[in-house]
Interface confidence: low
């Protein structure tokens, strides 16, 4: 056959559906691929073509579009399944062709089981709310285009098990889920099941997607560094190791990049001849505050080296900071043989 | 105010299973953890639990897994820690203790009760 | 798991004094996740500081918390009468959640 562009697996697209669901799948290629969209391209003439391979198989298939019910048809650049069975988990091709043109890239599709808890092994979007910080929504995702807008769906929210009914501070407001005051308990798998009529049937959607509760914007502070500090005087004798951790504590903010760096007589480590190794640690408390350390390393300091500028900074979209350890030499102790008796005027 | 209120001192011999309620009044019970924590005489606090009761799910210290169970009553808003295969170090008095709201913390704590195992 | 180690075991002061109490931590605890807690004989334990060191509701201010990392800290500025108790530091950052033994203050 001719030459096909062929674009590959689209891994970036791991596509996951739950079994006995509708599932609606565009074609990669106008999204990601192409610079036209669908309809320009068939109003030029191209034809798009489906076909897939099984899990486990090499072999390609075209799709069988003539199943009872019309279980899977496509329309336009979509492949619609009605519902999915645990059997069509495969790879799946959309080819875009006509005599002179082909273009076409493949994708996986994994079907799911849930139970009755909708645990799955579904990977799950995460919706971050800020603790304390008024009314807050999420929408129950990816359920557009599944019906028209003259049909009303019945949509029911579910915490982990759970129907959310009667709960203090949680509202299911049909396609919205209202937090009036979120709260680290607050945090957990929320699911919306959408069920609506179609052509004498009814169908489901399930969505779940976790929430995580972070710290608000209002309590949000400049970075603060725990160590260096006033208390801790970094005292060594030359040819010891040096070690000064850098410990700096971040407020969670939204798309902030949180930054600590040393400076050694105001240069960067990488900058300056001595041999310094740098160690970094990162850990985060429950509301995604993060604390960062920082160990600078010097394995054997040369007197020269104790007499240096050490400074740790740090910075967030909240500010900057920076604080200076506090080095110096070790003064040798005297040895009372020579030293010490010297001054009691032994000679 | 959120206050819990714990069941009776109990007497038990060894083998044998134990259940202690917590129950909560005054204020929402099923989005807080509920977590047990035990204190043997004379000894410190030693933390063996905890289940959130919207969720259902329990959580529990690996030197008791295989011997305690929590579930929680919703309707009642009550809390309960069963350990079973009683030995005698278990004598210990068992607290429940609310996971605080914002502070994850045990900010209110059960009044305590005394479970004493011997033959 | 991370062990959490309290000292001194028992600190003697009178009355007035300032009681400084220690916590080490085994691995580094989210500088969000310590607490302390007072535990008066045949009393259910009380939280005193939650977040290393915010206050609980109703503790009154002579009671700190400080500390990051390993190391942390309980200060009572002036020791009143009923401040003489056991006091234990928790982690709750990390499962399972970890007790220090404590450390008794003690009438001098």
């Known amino acids: 056959s001719e030459r096909c562009d062929d674009w590959g697996l689209d891994t970036m697209r791991q596509i996951q559906v739950f079994e006995d669901e509708p599932a609606r799948i565009k074609c990669p290629l106008f999204e990601h691929f192409l610079k036209f969209n669908y309809s320009t391209a068939h109003s030029a003439g191209l034809t798009l073509i489906w076909y897939w391979t099984r899990q486990d198989r090499d072999l390609e298939e075209p799709i069988n579009f003539r199943l009872p019910e019309n279980r899977i048809s496509k329309e336009k650049d979509v492949l619609w399944f009605r519902p999915t069975l645990l059997n069509d988990t495969g790879n799946y091709t959309c080819m875009l062709r006509n005599t002179t043109y082909c273009s076409k890239v493949a994708f996986p599709l994994e079907v799911v089981q849930k139970d009755s808890c909708f645990n799955s092994p579904m990977k799950l979007p995460v919706h971050k709310l800020y603790i304390e910080y008024g009314i807050q929504r999420i929408t129950c995702p990816n359920v557009d285009g599944y019906f028209p807008s003259s049909v009303k769906p019945t949509i029911t929210w579910y915490m982990g098990c759970y129907k959310i009914q009667n709960f203090n501070n949680v509202i299911p407001e049909g396609m919205n889920l209202s937090f009036l005051i979120a709260l680290i308990s607050n945090n957990g798998n929320y699911t919306c099941v959408v069920t609506y009529p179609e052509n004498g049937r009814t169908f489901h959607l399930t969505r779940t997607l976790t929430v995580k509760v972070v710290g608000s914007p209002k309590n949000a502070v400049p970075p603060v560094i725990h160590s260096p500090n006033d208390h801790v005087v970094y005292e060594k004798e030359p040819g010891e190791e040096l070690l000064i951790p850098c410990t700096v504590y971040f407020s969670f903010l939204m798309d902030s990049r949180n930054e600590v760096w040393w400076t050694i007589d105001g240069k960067k480590p990488d900058d300056i001849t001595i041999d310094v190794t740098i160690n970094e640690s990162i850990s985060h408390s429950r509301t995604e505050d993060e604390t960062r350390t920082q160990i600078l390393s010097i394995k054997k300091v040369t007197s020269e080296d104790l007499k240096r500028s050490y400074v740790c900074h740090a910075r967030s979209a909240k500010g900057e900071v920076a604080k200076a350890a506090k080095v110096k030499q070790k003064v040798p102790a005297p040895r009372y043989t020579v030293e010490l008796a010297c001054g009691f005027g032994a000679t | 105010q959120v206050q819990l209120l714990q069941s009776g001192a109990e007497v038990k011999k060894p083998g044998s299973s134990v259940k202690v309620s917590c129950k909560a009044s005054?204020?929402?019970?099923?989005?807080?953890?509920i977590d047990w924590v035990r204190q043997a005489p004379g000894q410190g606090l030693e933390w063996m639990g905890g289940?959130?009761?919207?969720?259902?799910?329990?959580n529990s210290a690996q030197n008791f897994q295989g011997r305690i169970t929590i579930t929680a009553d919703k309707s009642t808003n009550t809390a309960y820690m069963e350990l079973s295969s009683l030995r005698s170090e278990d004598t210990a008095v068992y607290y429940c203790?609310?996971?605080?709201?914002?502070?994850?913390?045990?900010?209110?704590w059960g009044q305590g009760t005394m479970v004493t195992v011997f033959s | 798991e991370i062990v959490l180690t309290q000292s001194p075991g028992t600190l003697s002061l009178s009355p007035g004094e300032r009681a400084t109490l220690s916590c080490r931590a085994s691995?580094?605890?989210?500088?969000?996740?310590l607490a302390w807690f007072q535990q008066r004989p045949g009393q259910a334990p009380r939280l005193l500081i939650y977040?290393?060191?915010r206050r609980a509701t109703g503790i009154p201010d002579r009671f700190s918390g400080s500390g990051s990392g390993t190391d942390f800290t309980l200060t009572i500025s002036r020791l009143e009468p009923e401040d003489f108790a056991v006091y234990y530091c928790?982690?709750?950052?990390?499962?399972?959640?970890?007790f220090g033994g404590g450390t008794k203050v003690e009438i001098k």
């Open positions: 977040g290393v060191s």
């Open positions: 691995l580094s605890v989210s500088s969000n996740y």
């Open positions: 928790q982690q709750y950052g990390s499962s399972p959640l970890t």
């Open positions: 289940i959130i009761p919207i969720f259902g799910t329990e």
């Open positions: 203790a609310r996971n605080g709201a914002t502070s994850d913390a045990f900010d209110i």
């Open positions: 005054g204020g929402t019970f099923s989005i807080y953890a």
